[in-house]
Interface confidence: medium
């Protein structure tokens, strides 16, 4: 009975800061009663814990049971299909889920105009699930960087990409008029984590902000 069902073809994590989601692809020809069992293994404690006996979705939020991710050696997860009394073999994640797999994001970007500059402030993510002491800046305490992309509207091609090494940055507006849109992508220079571009924040410059600087 144990191997009558095919296994999920693939299982993987997609994670942002304290938002750790396990995904899998469905088995072929699954029925309306097919569901999926999820189990989790923490490196250093070599036993599998059952997390969900019967998930009918193709993803599962494991944040609550992986809150120590940023202080651990990581996790593996496995998923199998279940249909009544039948179940498939387990499909295990190909890679260790560790802090390195977390995609870095920002909370938001705030823009304001002051003395001829657009002042940008990058708000770091503050997920509700994160323990009080586990802030973005405490976990990634050094070498935080942010790539800044600026688009002039209308303008169909030029982005300016620069890196800043602080959560605050300034854009010189003198002599410029129009709408400017800014996106930010975080990184940590000492780490290999991917970063995700923030949503665009835009601000309009008019002649009233005109100043000359040298």
């Amino acid at each position: 009975h144990g191997t009558e069902l095919p296994s999920p073809p693939s299982v993987w994590f997609e994670a942002e800061f304290f938002h750790h989601i396990l995904h899998w692809t469905p088995i072929p020809n699954q029925s309306e009663s097919t569901c999926y069992e999820v189990a989790l293994l923490r490196y250093g404690i070599e036993s599998w814990n059952s997390i969900s006996n019967c998930s009918q979705t193709l993803s599962y939020d494991l944040t609550a049971v992986t809150l120590d991710l940023y202080h651990s050696n990581g996790y593996r997860a496995r998923v199998r299909a279940v249909d009544g009394s039948r179940h498939s073999n387990w499909t295990v994640t190909n890679t260790r889920f560790s802090v390195d797999e977390v995609t870095l994001t920002v909370g938001s970007v705030n823009l304001e105009i002051h003395n001829g500059f657009i002042l940008g402030k990058i708000q770091l993510p503050r997920p509700k699930m994160a323990p009080a002491n586990d802030t973005y800046e405490s976990i990634f305490s050094h070498f935080r960087e942010y790539e800044i992309a600026i688009r002039k509207v209308p303008g169909n091609f030029t982005f300016t990409h620069k890196k800043v090494k602080h959560e605050n940055f300034s854009l010189l507006t003198s002599g410029e008029v129009g709408e400017f849109c800014v996106q930010v992508k975080p990184s940590v220079a000492s780490r290999s984590n991917k970063g995700m571009w923030s949503k665009e924040e835009c601000i309009s410059l008019t002649r009233q902000y005109f100043t000359v600087t040298n």
Epitope: T158, T160, H161, F169, L171, L172
Partner: nanobody
Framework: DLQLVESGGGLVQPGGSLRLSCAAS????????IDWFRQAPGKEREGVSC????????TYADSVKGRFTISRDNAKNTVYLQMNSLKPEDTAVYYC?????????????????WGQGTQVTVSS
Amino acid sequence: DLQLVESGGGLVQPGGSLRLSCAASGFTLDSYAIDWFRQAPGKEREGVSCISSSGISTTYADSVKGRFTISRDNAKNTVYLQMNSLKPEDTAVYYCAAAALCMSGTYYAGPGYWGQGTQVTVSS
């Protein structure tokens, strides 16, 4: 094809001068700020100077203030960097880049519309 081309580099003695040019083809520079930046061997790329699209506003790195002057001729679709009182530490490849705005307190990361660079060597 969108392209920026730098020229005017060369070998010059300490205290000498050079004038770098940044010319655009395939698009007009007058809608964009222009950055000059440089990269010396084994060092990070650093911003040198930036000029706003109108040409009214300019910024300079502390290391070149009073010695370098940035200007633009939108009719010729060209931006210039006049470099006086050159020092050996100015030796680098100099690049220009089209920008939406000048940015302060940052270094250029790319990618973007920037050229292949022109070598400036200051040596006696």
